[in-house]
Each structure stands twice: as C-alpha cells, then as structure tokens.
C-alpha cells in the first residue's frame, strides 16, 4: 500500500543468470549423398550465448549450412533472383537480399533454373523453414538461476533475491515456492500462458519481471521480489513481417588447408529480465 509519509526511491539493480540442462538432438545428416539419423548432445556452451544487459538466450532450433568456402557459385534462387542471360546480372552489385557480390554472369543453379553467379561463402544459404518440431524442444526442461542484487543508495540499503536459507535444488512455483530463484523454462512459458513447444520453432522474446516493493522502515520491514512473466515479441507469427527470434553465427575450421565454415541460423528464446520497483523509508 502507498505510504505517503515515506521517501520513495527507484531500485538500482544488477542481474546474473546461469542456465543448466542437457539436450539430445536427433536430426538428418547427409554425408556423401547418404542421409542418415545423427545424434548429438548439446550442453550449456552449445545453446546459450552471452548477451549484453539483463538478457540471456537459449537456442531451441537451428538450420545449418555446412562446409561453406569463399569462392564463386550460383546464388540461391529466391523469389526474383533468377536470370536468363548475363544482362540481368550486374558485376560488382551487392543486392541486400543476396549473400554475395555478383560477377556479372548468369549461370545454372540446377537443371531448370539459372541465377546470377556471386562471389560468396558457397554454397549460398538455402531459404529453409525452421524444423518442426524444434530440434531442442527439450530445452523446456532447462533451468535458469537468476541472481539479482538490488540497491537503494539514498536509503543505504542493499539486498538480493537469493537468501542464505534457500535450497539450491528448489524450483520456482507461484504458490508453493514463490521465492525460489531457479526457474524451469517450460514453467515460465506456462505462467505467461504460452506454448513452449510452439514458440521454440521460430523463437521469441520472453520477459521475466522482478518487482521489488520494499518497505525499509525497521518496524514493518519487507523487501522481497515478486516474479511475473509475459511474452514480449509479436506472437502472431503469420501477421508479423519477420516472425520469431533468430540470428546467424559461424564456426570456422580448416580442411586440406582451405578455410571453411558452418553457418548456423539459430532460433531461440531471448529472455529479458526487467527489474523495477521502489524502496520507501520514513
């Protein structure tokens, strides 16, 4: 309740997160023209990426373009990229939608289609749909530990969400354990009224709100966080221009003295931790 006699001050906060969990991924792997089922294990280093600010990212799906080399090749025949003669291809042109610099030649992409040749990482990335169901759908069972230190400088008061009495094996529950700072990712989505399995395919942005309403008067002291969750990106993927949340990164290696890379288009959930609240003292 609003105590008018108190001097209020906004919270100053720092956040640190630690994600834990292992995922087993089964996907089709093509080697030498033969497609077979491949199994791989993903640990924290494989699916989380350091982000700036109060955010962390968990990869839930991906599309790989393996063995790319910097050379010449036909560009992927996306809409509007096909050609019938060299006139359609402009030497030195860098189309923002393209993956390379045009050489000026119209070359065969396959049996029926021709596209402009480009100097690029080849073969150029295909426009593939994100796998469904998501490859790391088991990320639903990963957990994140959120460490949140807060400070009210005007009141010379510092505290944190993790208490010495807390059990390291607890899991947050709105009713049974609302002060536990270890959250199961699937539970965060459930609390926000979202379907993890569905969002995991294209990715998305989830907000974890930590609200501190602190009464710092000694006779009625209370300063504990309240957690709530809501989806922050546009959930109507059919209507939104670029649905979900994804980015590309590459793993570089050398093979027979040729520099190669595996390009990975990573889809996943970016979790934004939003800390707000006030501290009041007479």
């Amino acid at each position: 309740s609003d105590k008018l006699y108190q001097r209020k001050e906004p919270v100053i906060s720092s956040v640190h997160t630690k994600v834990k969990g292992i995922a087993e991924v089964t996907e089709n792997v093509t080697e030498g023209g033969v497609t077979k089922l491949g199994h791989s294990i993903f640990d924290t280093a494989d699916y989380t990426f350091p982000l700036q600010g109060n955010s962390f990212f968990v990869m839930t799906n991906y599309v790989k373009s393996e063995g790319q080399v910097q050379t010449l090749c036909p560009e992927y025949p996306r809409r509007g990229a096909q050609c019938s003669s060299d006139r359609r291809c402009k030497k030195g042109w860098m189309d923002p939608q393209s993956k390379g610099i045009q050489t000026g030649r119209c070359v065969p992409y396959d049996k029926t289609r021709k596209t402009c040749e480009v100097s690029a990482w080849c073969p150029t990335e295909e426009e593939k749909e994100a796998p469904r169901p998501a490859l790391l759908r088991s990320a639903e069972n990963f957990t994140v530990l959120i460490k949140n230190n807060i400070h009210f400088p005007g009141h010379n008061y510092t505290t944190r969400n993790i208490l010495p009495t807390m059990n390291g094996s607890c899991t947050f529950h709105k009713t049974w354990d609302p002060q536990c700072s270890i959250f199961r990712l699937g539970d965060i989505f459930q609390e926000a009224g979202e379907n993890f399995t569905e969002v995991a395919v294209q990715g998305g942005i989830m907000g974890i709100e930590i609200y501190w309403d602190c009464n710092l008067d000694s006779w009625s002291h209370h300063c504990r966080p309240r957690y709530s969750f809501r989806r922050l990106d546009d959930k109507n993927t059919d209507e939104s221009f670029v649905p979900g949340y994804n980015f590309r990164y590459a793993k570089y290696y050398k093979e027979n003295n040729v520099e190669k890379r595996t390009l990975i288009k990573a889809f996943g959930i970016r979790f934004d931790i939003l800390v707000f609240g006030t501290g009041g003292k007479f």
Epitope: G67, L72, P74, D110, E117
Partner: nanobody
Framework: EVQLVESGGGLVQAGGSLRLSCAAS?????MGWFRQAPGKEREFVAG????????RYADSVKGRFTISRDNAKNAVSLQMSGLKPEDTAIYYC???????????WGQGTQVTVSS
C-alpha cells in the same frame, strides 16, 4: 539425379599422357575430377566452374593436369601429362554447386601408370 559417364582411362607409361572425358545428363555449374587409389580415400584432383571460371587443382597435379569445360555439351575433360606411378587410381567425374562442392559422381575409369 545427374548421370555421368567417364571415358579415356587406360594403361600408360610413366611420363606419358592421357585424356579423360566426362559427359553429364544435364547442365551443372561445376564439374570436376576425383581419384581413389587402392586402400586410400577419394581425393580431389581438379575442378572447373561455369565456362571454366574458376578452376581449381590439387597441389599434386598443378602444372601437369589441365581441366577444360564444354558447356554446350555438358562435358568436362582432364588432360593429364607427365604421369607418375602415384597417379594410378580410379578417376571419377563429379558435378556440383562450386569448385569445392560436389554432389554427384560417375562410375569411374581406371588409370594405370607403369614405371
């Protein structure tokens, strides 16, 4: 799927020459040659992009082998000179999306270099 037919293999003396040819059932951006010696892995020999641009050679054959393309015939040939016994292998024609990337291979033609 692209069909590839190789020809021109045979027995030749060290220092001699041989010309391998390959015809593809459809046009393709890159065509190249690989080889596999007994008990060894298949290795890249030479590759050519559309109209012969770019070309790429394995270090072991540079200056001795020349690859050439005939786009009109969907064909590629490999002129091999200064042959050595270590060039003995089954030579495979291949097609792909760049001079580094190949998806389809022919049945192969045997090249034997005697000393």
């Amino acid at each position: 799927e692209v069909q590839l037919v190789e020809s021109g293999g045979g027995l030749v003396q060290a220092g001699g020459s041989l010309r391998l040819s390959c015809a593809a059932s459809e046009r393709t951006y890159s065509m190249g040659w690989f080889r596999q010696a007994p008990g060894k892995e298949r290795e890249f020999v030479a590759g050519s992009g559309w109209d012969g641009i770019p070309t790429r050679y394995a270090d072991s054959v540079k200056g001795r082998f020349t690859i050439s393309r005939d786009n009109a015939k969907n064909a590629v040939s490999l002129q091999m000179s200064g042959l050595k016994p270590e060039d003995t292998a089954i030579y495979y024609c291949a097609t792909g999306t760049s001079v580094y990337h190949y998806q389809y291979w022919g049945q192969g033609t045997q090249v034997t270099v005697s000393s």
